[in-house]
């Protein structure tokens, strides 16, 4: 045996000289090498570099380096290569997570849903319904719900209130002198005060990343249509400043689109599990009426999924 189980000083190991039977204390070899010749009464131990395909992580007294793990099976990629100092380490590529020994695509949160928790190489994305005052108009595995454009803050009118799937549509304000109220034929864009924002069902899917709270979704590419979840499309806020009861329904598993969306880095937010997220502040420059307010890319440094 190259190493005895007896105590030895740090940085040394015990070796029994096979010819004399004498127990010798030898210096260990550094990480990335192994003991090609043990020490004797007359000589120091000899270290050699680990051959290709093998490694040692720590200083040691072993006579042979450890074999590296097998090459990463598709679609995994190497996080660390097999080298003298490190074993090969495989991880799922960006946009995928490890599930049952293989890689599955991150759930894509559907329109009307945003990312509540971003995915990692070991955990799927968690989706949530966009809450009052927020929306998501593209399927994405990285974007949070974004706040509706603040039309009033830009001195514009809400021509069409946003929903959880669409932004507010802003238009030029119509100014009338106090002495000349608008005639009955003039169109002014009023803001209904009590429209249920998500009460008009449309699609009924739930993204996979919304399974039980403490569950990690295990799935391969999913495109499933969960049961019983309505994706309402009624206005979520009457105006930026006076919103209606928007909904932030959190579908347990919004449908997933299996393709990955380019990170649009738009913000979303969640409050109670769903609506308190994201802080995307945005502004849209609508000059002509009507114009859809485009949230500007958040100036937030991190594109934390939960953020954008």
């Amino acid at each position: 045996q190259p190493e005895q189980k007896t105590l030895s000083l740090p940085g040394t190991y015990r070796h029994v000289d096979r010819t004399t039977g004498q127990v010798l204390t030898c210096d260990k070899c550094p990480a990335g090498t192994y003991v090609s010749e043990h020490c004797t009464n007359m000589s120091l131990r000899v270290c050699s570099s680990c051959p290709a395909g093998t490694f040692t992580r720590h200083e040691n007294g072993i006579e042979r380096c450890h074999d590296c793990s097998q090459p990463c099976p598709w679609p995994m990629i190497e996080r660390l290569p097999c080298a003298a100092l490190t074993d090969r380490e495989c991880i799922c590529p960006p946009g995928m997570y490890q599930s049952n020994g293989t890689c599955a695509p991150h759930t894509v949160c559907p329109v009307g849903w945003g990312v509540r928790k971003k995915g990692t190489e070991n955990e799927d994305v968690r989706c949530k319904q966009c809450a009052r005052g927020t929306f998501s108009d593209v399927p994405s595995s990285v974007m949070k719900c974004k706040a509706h454009t603040d039309c009033l803050g830009q001195n514009l009118e809400v021509v069409k209130p946003g929903t959880k799937e669409t932004d507010n549509v802003c238009g030029m304000r119509l100014f009338f002198s106090s002495t000349n109220p608008p005639s009955s034929g003039t169109v002014t864009f009023s803001h209904p005060e009590h429209m249920e924002s998500h009460d008009v069902p449309s699609s009924t899917y739930e993204p996979q990343g919304m399974n039980s709270t403490d569950s990690n979704s295990t799935a391969s590419v999913r495109t499933k249509v969960p049961s019983g979840i309505e994706e309402g499309t009624v206005p979520d806020n009457t105006s930026s400043t006076s919103g209606k009861e928007g909904t932030n329904r959190t579908l347990p598993n919004p449908p997933q689109v299996t393709h990955q969306q380019a990170p649009h880095h738009r913000h979303i937010l969640k409050l109670l599990p769903s609506s308190m997220e994201a802080t995307g502040e945005k502004s849209s420059t609508a000059i002509k009426a009507p114009k859809r307010g485009h949230p500007r890319q958040n100036a937030h440094k991190h594109f934390d999924i939960n953020e954008h």
Epitope: K128, Q129, R132, A147, L251, N253, S274
Partner: antibody, heavy 115, light 110 residues
Amino acid sequence: EVQLLESGGGLVQPGGSLRLSCAASGFTFSNYEMSWVRQAPGKGLEWVSSIYSSGGETLYADSVKGRFTISRDNSKNTLYLQMNSLRAEDTAVYYCARDGAADYWGQGTLVTVSS
Amino acid sequence: QSELTQPPSASGTPGQWVTISCSGSTSNIGNNYVYWYQQLPGTAPKLLIYTNNQRPSGVPDRFSGSKSGTSASLAISGLRSEDEADYYCATWDDSLYAPVFGGGTKVTVL
């Protein structure tokens, strides 16, 4: 008009159980995430639990995890909170709230845990 | 101890401007929207501000919200006696994976 009406509160001994209900009306209940938030006497608001519109995902505060269970019956427009192994520190007014933004709240129901 | 820090109290005379702060961290306010709730004595909380600075219909424009970095604030201009209440800020916390509330601020109209 959106209305949330909690019920089921009362006096219970430590270790006991209680089931709170929240009857919703005035909106499409099945479209909304719902939550329970509590307020101990003279204290601030504390989020307790939330459930997605279909019931597929639930979230719990660490202080109640493993003891409380949130559920909903969309056919009855009702939200529930099953509270087991109750402790004195669970004494509070329990509110149900609508949407992730908690845009509407019920009037609350008082739960007193005392021997 | 709350993840969001609010001053326990604030006060002002009628007509004055009062500001309530809410301090958090990158994992909550810094990365998520802020909500404010008003709780009048003996009543349930009511949503006052959502997504940092938006008011639900029916909320007077005397109330305004703002957010900067990891802090948020609620301003009440033209303070009125009916504004005497407890005010709470709230947001989502990415690290806790849960919503969090501030400890609340009691506003007194002198």
